[in-house]
């Protein structure tokens, strides 16, 4: 379904009161940092493309961000605009296309060779009581529900994937590392270009679950190289 294709753990989308996208179908997916996109107009064809009004980036498609169509334009009139490619100027992560993020005012690639997505180095560090102060929602897991005997739940800090409970992996989120869900069939995944290289994505996705591999979605073969959508598919 469209929902399962769109749903990803790169970063989570906001509840309707915050995200302002209650009427949109689908979930969020983002390889672009800082951004979440419920629905948006990504799946409209060019022929029936209409400027999509928005209040914030979450309301736009994966390859879009929310801004005034004219430079220095009225902030009250904002639409979803096409994301900016590598080396283009940016003012926030949302403006950069998937696989890039905004650093020092320029969209830069999220790929850096020195980082491996699933860091399995042997760090001999014991976990003590570690209580984060983020709270406020009825269903929550904080960064820090780690104890000696428990495996980290979603949102718990981690050093390696073995620190996380079953079905979770240890991945980067912003500048920290937390347990995130392993991807299920149909979910968007990140295909890294070189074997053994995991991108330094500011919002890093987990790998595909058992029996699944990250492959180009069949109906996206015709798309341009940069915009091919990879999803977790059965071997």
């Amino acid at each position: 379904t469209l929902n399962s294709v769109l749903n990803s753990n790169a970063i989570k989308n906001l509840p309707p009161p915050l995200g302002g996208a209650a009427g949109h179908p689908g979930s969020a997916v983002s390889a672009a940092p800082g951004i979440l996109y419920p629905g948006g107009n990504k799946y409209q064809t060019i022929d029936n493309y209409q400027p999509y009004p928005c209040a914030e980036d979450e309301e736009c498609g994966t390859d879009e961000y929310c801004a005034s169509p004219t430079r220095g334009g009225d902030a009250g009139v904002q639409i979803c605009l096409a994301c900016r490619k590598r080396r283009k100027r940016c003012m926030r992560h949302a403006m950069c296309c998937p696989g890039n993020y905004c650093k020092n005012g320029i969209c830069v690639s999220s790929d850096q060779n020195h980082f491996r997505g699933e860091i399995e180095e042997t760090i001999t560090e014991s976990f003590g009581n570690d209580h984060s102060t983020l709270d406020g929602y009825s269903r929550r897991t904080t960064l820090s529900s780690k104890m000696y005997h428990t495996k980290g739940q979603e949102g718990s800090v981690c050093l390696r994937s073995s620190d996380c409970a079953s079905g979770l992996c240890c991945a980067r989120h912003f500048w920290s590392k937390i347990c995130k869900p392993v991807l299920k069939e149909g979910q968007v995944c990140t295909k890294h270009r070189r074997k053994g290289s995991h991108g330094l994505e500011i919002f890093q996705r987990c790998y595909c679950g058992e029996g699944l591999s990250c492959r180009i979605q069949k109906d996206h073969h015709q798309a341009s190289n940069s915009s091919r959508l990879h999803t977790c598919q059965r071997h």
């Epitope: 949302a94 984060s132 009825s138 800090v157 989120h173």
Partner: antibody, heavy 125, light 107 residues
């Protein structure tokens, strides 16, 4: 308990250097992004720099880029800020802060959830 | 960079009254990454609200946050003596920026 303690502040002449430290305890330091934030006397908060959990990536405010260096030693649970070519406008209380991420239902949220008490840097001739 | 403008600069309110603090961004900000902090004289800032509306641990329910896009609000429903302080909003877009702060003082 979760605690951050800054040290290394003091009075220094313009153009000179200073290194601040932030000792972390009570949490898994090596999994968290860490920040430096400063506050000039009588002014608001200004973000200075952030470093990735493993020290392999960092990011600076334009005002300090090329002069300040953020680093960390995860084996010592310590964050550092090396400040070179100091200017009068760098005079401030410097805080280290921990990046926090919460998961609520299907959503991730962000905030600087733990702060140190601050260390004062005065740049004066 | 994204500029956050807080208003008013100073808010004079009597204890027990409601206080409404505004934070306006120069461009759209993801609600996920909009936070509010409280700072008292001589103390470090304290996280109050994250994700525009989520209360941090130990924060009383008289504090609430709302808003999306470019306009965000921090509301203190009934001011207690200990609430008189400076309040900052903060975002993470491409860089981390704080608003200039709103001082809530006793009327």
């Amino acid at each position: 308990q979760v605690q951050l303690v800054e040290s290394g502040g003091g009075v220094v002449q313009p153009g000179r250097s200073l290194r601040l430290s932030c000792a972390a305890s009570g949490f898994t330091f090596s999994s968290y992004g860490m920040h430096w934030v400063r506050q000039a006397p009588g002014k608001g908060l200004e973000w200075v720099a952030v470093i990735l959990y493993d020290g392999s990536d960092n990011y600076y405010a334009d005002s300090v880029k090329g002069r300040f260096t953020i680093s960390r030693d995860n084996s010592k649970n310590t964050l550092y800020l090396q400040m070179n070519s100091l200017r009068a406008e760098d005079t401030a209380v410097y805080y280290c802060a921990r990046e926090g991420i919460a998961v609520a239902g299907d959503y991730y949220y962000y905030g600087m959830d733990v702060w140190g008490q601050g260390t004062t840097v005065t740049v004066s001739s | 960079e994204i500029v956050l403008t807080q208003s008013p600069g100073t808010l004079s309110v009597s204890p027990g009254e409601r206080a409404t603090l505004s934070c306006r961004a120069s461009q759209s900000v993801s609600s996920s990454y909009l936070a509010w902090y409280q700072q008292k004289p001589g103390q470090a800032p304290r996280l109050l609200i994250y994700g525009a509306s989520g209360r941090a641990t130990g924060i009383p329910d008289r504090f609430s946050g709302s808003g999306s896009g470019t306009d965000f609000i921090l509301t203190i429903s009934r001011l207690e003596p200990e609430d008189f302080a400076v309040y900052y909003c903060q975002q993470y877009g491409s860089s981390f920026t704080f608003g200039g702060g709103t001082k809530v003082e006793i009327k």
